[in-house]
């Protein structure tokens, strides 16, 4: 039960995280005009990964896409790449994890296969989250560097008379969305990996186990659930995993011990 809950929760947390990464990537407010200790402007500038926008005091907003590819800073390209890789890995991870969910039965898929898929999706989520966190952090670092550079020469004058006020940019909402979303995806991935351990069948193959029940001899052989005795209830019979194939009925009739952890 705890494994199913951990896996399900990991999936949901990762889903929210990846939705957040997608939202952050699409958002325009990666960097916003710094309003503190600046001349009060009648416009508000903000920039995203794909376009820059200006909101005028009237409320009129104008956005321009970055139509050049080669003319953009390498760091911006790197951030774009990290975010896209994060989204792609996350999307694939989500797809894999759907099939790996314990509560969803697909054909005669074994627990070991589900465990492997859970681990795969977990790793994908972890890498996806790390990509998003790295992307946002690189952009934030770029902003901090530019902020102090523009502060150092905030007023760059020609001959001292005419001044050009440099617009300083600070952290936009998308950065915080990205950090949180990346963190959630990472946590979801870790949860999936933890769930995988619970899903994985025990590796030990028992050669033979026999014990004497009162009046009856019941031998357990590797590969079977029980040796039929012709007597009614078999609720005391213990399933011995051997990694062998089982029928769908067996999967349904005999829940794994891990469901009751």
């Amino acid at each position: 039960m705890a494994v199913t809950a951990c896996q399900g929760l990991g999936f949901v947390v990762s889903l929210i995280g990846i939705a957040g990464i997608i939202a952050a990537t699409c958002m325009d407010q990666w960097s916003t005009q710094d309003l503190y200790n600046n001349p009060v402007t009648a416009v508000f500038n903000y920039q995203g990964l794909w376009r820059s926008c200006v909101r005028e005091s009237s409320g009129f907003t104008e956005c321009r896409g970055y139509f050049t590819l080669l003319g953009l800073p390498a760091m911006l390209q790197a951030v774009r790449a990290l975010m896209i890789v994060g989204i792609v890995l996350g999307a694939i991870g989500l797809l894999v994890s759907i099939f790996a969910l314990k509560c969803i039965r697909i054909g005669s898929m074994e627990d070991s296969a589900k465990a492997n898929m859970t681990l795969t999706s977990g790793i994908m989520f972890i890498v996806s989250g790390l990509c998003a966190i790295a992307g946002v952090s690189v952009f934030a670092n770029m902003l901090v560097t530019n902020f102090w550079m523009s502060t150092a020469n905030m007023y760059t004058g020609m001959g001292g008379m005419v001044q050009t006020v440099q617009t300083r940019y600070t952290f936009g909402a998308a950065l915080f969305v990205g950090w949180v979303a990346g963190g959630l995806t990472l946590i979801g991935g870790v949860m999936m990996c933890i769930a995988c351990r619970g899903l994985a069948p025990e590796e030990t193959n028992y050669k033979a186990v026999s014990y004497h029940a009162s009046g009856h001899s019941v031998a357990y052989k590797p590969g079977g659930f029980k040796a039929s005795t012709g007597f009614g209830s078999n609720t005391k019979n213990k399933k011995i995993y051997d990694g062998g194939a089982r029928t769908e009925d067996e999967v349904q009739s005999y829940p794994s011990k891990h469901d009751y952890v």
């Epitope: 005009q33 001349p39 009060v40 402007t41 009648a42 416009v43 500038n45 903000y46 920039q47 820059s52 926008c53 200006v54 005028e56 005091s57 009237s58 409320g59 009129f60 104008e62 321009r64 005419v162 001044q163 050009t164 006020v165 440099q166 617009t167």
Partner: antibody
Framework: EVQLVESGGGLVQPGGSLRLSCAAS????????IHWVRQAPGKGLEWVAY????????YYADTVKGRFTISRDNAKNSLYLQMNSLRAEDTAVYYC?????????????WGQGTTVTVSS | DIVMTQSPDSLAVSLGERATISCKSS????????????LAWYQQKPGQPPKLLIY???TRASGVPDRFSGSGSGTDFTLTISSLQAEDVAVYYC?????????FGQGTKLEIK
């Protein structure tokens, strides 16, 4: 047709108060920021104050800060300028002007103005 | 505050001739975010309120004749009337629309020679 009509001007003694009004019609008042601009006799234009669409952003000229208060009532399509502690240098024609939506913050429509005279 | 300086203070031009008014700002009115200039030109005829002629340094407001044109960028701007008409006699003001407090030039009085 866009119309802005100012009222409330008159003669007031120094230190006195006056409340100017600006009635708007012919456009959706709540969609636009509005400015007050004044012009002293024989002088140039001087921007006084600005209020945004939803009154969330308000700016004043340094010369009137702390003495003048701009406000608006979108339900009544009206703009106000409460002027306290009036001085002789506040004598001017006061215009209300609409901040254009896509005119790079320029004022696209102006009222005819109302005259304020501060004198003892 | 941004200081707007117009020149000349007054100008006399013959009908049909070109009139040029200059405006300089103490700081650049070019917004880095969209590479647009936030400068407007107004015309004020005697006894009337100002009328918007040009915004964004070069865009004519609706209903403004095409003989009026604006140019310039950053700190130096120009209003040009290509062929002066009698009805163009007025005072012309430039205005900073980028920084609060919004500031106007002192005005240029245009007359017919």
């Amino acid at each position: 047709e866009v119309q802005l009509v100012e009222s409330g001007g008159g003669l007031v003694q120094p230190g006195g108060s006056l409340r100017l009004s600006c009635a708007a019609s012919g456009f959706t008042f709540s969609d636009y920021g509005i400015h007050w601009v004044r012009q002293a006799p024989g002088k140039g234009l001087e921007w006084v104050a600005y209020i945004s669409r939803g009154s969330s952003t308000i700016y004043y000229a340094d010369t009137v800060k702390g003495r003048f208060t701009i406000s608006r009532d979108n339900a009544k399509n009206s703009l106000y300028l409460q002027m306290n502690s009036l001085r002789a240098e506040d004598t001017a024609v006061y215009y209300c002007a609409r901040g254009g939506y896509d005119t790079r913050n320029a004022m696209d429509y102006w009222g005819q103005g109302t005259t304020v005279t501060v004198s003892s | 505050d941004i200081v707007m300086t117009q020149s000349p203070d007054s100008l006399a031009v013959s009908l049909g001739e070109r009139a040029t008014i200059s405006c300089k700002s103490s700081q650049s009115l070019l917004n880095s975010g969209n590479q647009k200039n936030y400068l407007a030109w107004y015309q004020q005829k005697p006894g009337q309120p100002p009328k918007l002629l040009i915004y964004g340094a070069s865009t004519r407001a609706s209903g403004v004749p095409d003989r009026f044109s604006g140019s310039g960028s950053g700190t130096d701007f120009t209003l040009t009337i290509s062929s002066l008409q009698a009805e163009d006699v007025a005072v012309y003001y430039c205005q900073n629309d980028l920084y609060y407090p919004l500031t106007f030039g002192q005005g240029t009085k245009l007359e017919i020679k």
